[in-house]
Amino acid sequence: VPRWRQQWSGPGTTKRFPETVLARCVKYTEIHPEMRHVDCQSVWDAFKGAFISKHPCNITEEDYQPLMKLGTQTVPCNKILLWSRIKDLAHQFTQVQRDMFTLEDTLLGYLADDLTWCGEFNTSKINYQSCPDWRKDCSNNPVSVFWKTVSRRFAEAACDVVHVMLNGSRSKIFDKNSTFGSVEVHNLQPEKVQTLEAWVIHGGREDSRDLCQDPTIKELESIISKRNIQFSCKNIYRPDKFLQCVKNPEDSSCTSEI
């Protein structure tokens, strides 16, 4: 008799999820000498333990604590780049500017990037058919709680000037409901962070507007200022040129506004 299975609104667990997590862990620890001590089998066991046999709408940050402990990593606190709705460019930037880090450049972020996972209450099975959608089903699902947990810890670790890349092509350049707006902004530590520096990335070739004056950016500035952190903002009109100049600041095209 086939068991009844809960149908969720979101896509199911990414295929070959256990193998992918384990392979990513091995690759990361090989590339990053400071993480060579990490036992990837233990990491997978802790990851699995956070959601297997648990109701996928009832996951807590506490469930991920064993994984957080195993994945503890020190990144230079003044070299943190946050991003919102512009992940690809942020990652391209840190691939060039190797001393800066997005969350996905850390072990735990790297393991989970672009993956989906969930289990089922009272069975050891991974659900490859469907997983809860944050909006349509529940917010306390395994993926959302994971990213909330690691994002909070990442923001708490930041110091000096914290950089954030924002998508100037979106209707809400700063979105209070994004992970950046709902988690990271509120977990920057004013006693450690002097300034939040926003880089607003323009999408259109001929877009010369000052998007730092956008109402949502002003809202971000207000939230940050109330937390006793300074705020600054810079338009990046030509993201392609920006990346080129990060690679090679000597290039003659880097003399003008980017």
């Epitope: 000096d160 600054s232 100049c245 003399t255 506004e257």
Partner: nanobody, 122 residues
Framework: QVQLQESGGRLVQPGGSLRLSCAAS????????MAWFRQGPGKEREFVAS???????LYADFVKGRFTISRDNAKNTVYLQMDSLKPEDTTVYYC????????????????WGQGTQVTVSS
């Protein structure tokens, strides 16, 4: 290539003020983070303040509330306003530049000026 030239250093009394300037040539400063460092004889180069391409500032704890870094991109110049000067501020002050982001580590700056001497004494 960015060339940097500091000026404004001189003898000043304790409690007095001074404004250092750093003029850049060869590049527009608008894409560059600029910083001031200082170094006494036989000592390590020490971070004082920085201002990024987006004008966010960073200060060493020992100058917070006394020194202010600012920039004028039109004049291709960065300034360090030094108030409430103390005898221990006596040393050579250097201007430095790196693309985009201001940081504290001197090794991360590609371009340096020759320095300007500040002496605080009565």
């Amino acid at each position: 290539q960015v060339q940097l030239q500091e000026s404004g250093g001189r003898l000043v009394q304790p409690g007095g003020s001074l404004r250092l300037s750093c003029a850049a040539s060869g590049r527009t400063l608008s894409n560059y983070a600029m910083a001031w460092f200082r170094q006494g004889p036989g000592k390590e180069r020490e971070f004082v303040a920085s201002i990024s391409a987006s004008d966010s500032t960073l200060y060493a704890d020992f100058v917070k509330g006394r020194f202010t870094i600012s920039r004028d991109n039109a004049k291709n110049t960065v300034y360090l306003q030094m108030d409430s000067l103390k005898p221990e501020d006596t040393t050579v002050y250097y201007c430095a530049a790196r693309f985009w982001i201001g940081v504290r580590a001197p090794a991360e700056y590609n371009y340096w000026g020759q320095g300007t001497q500040v002496t605080v004494s009565s």
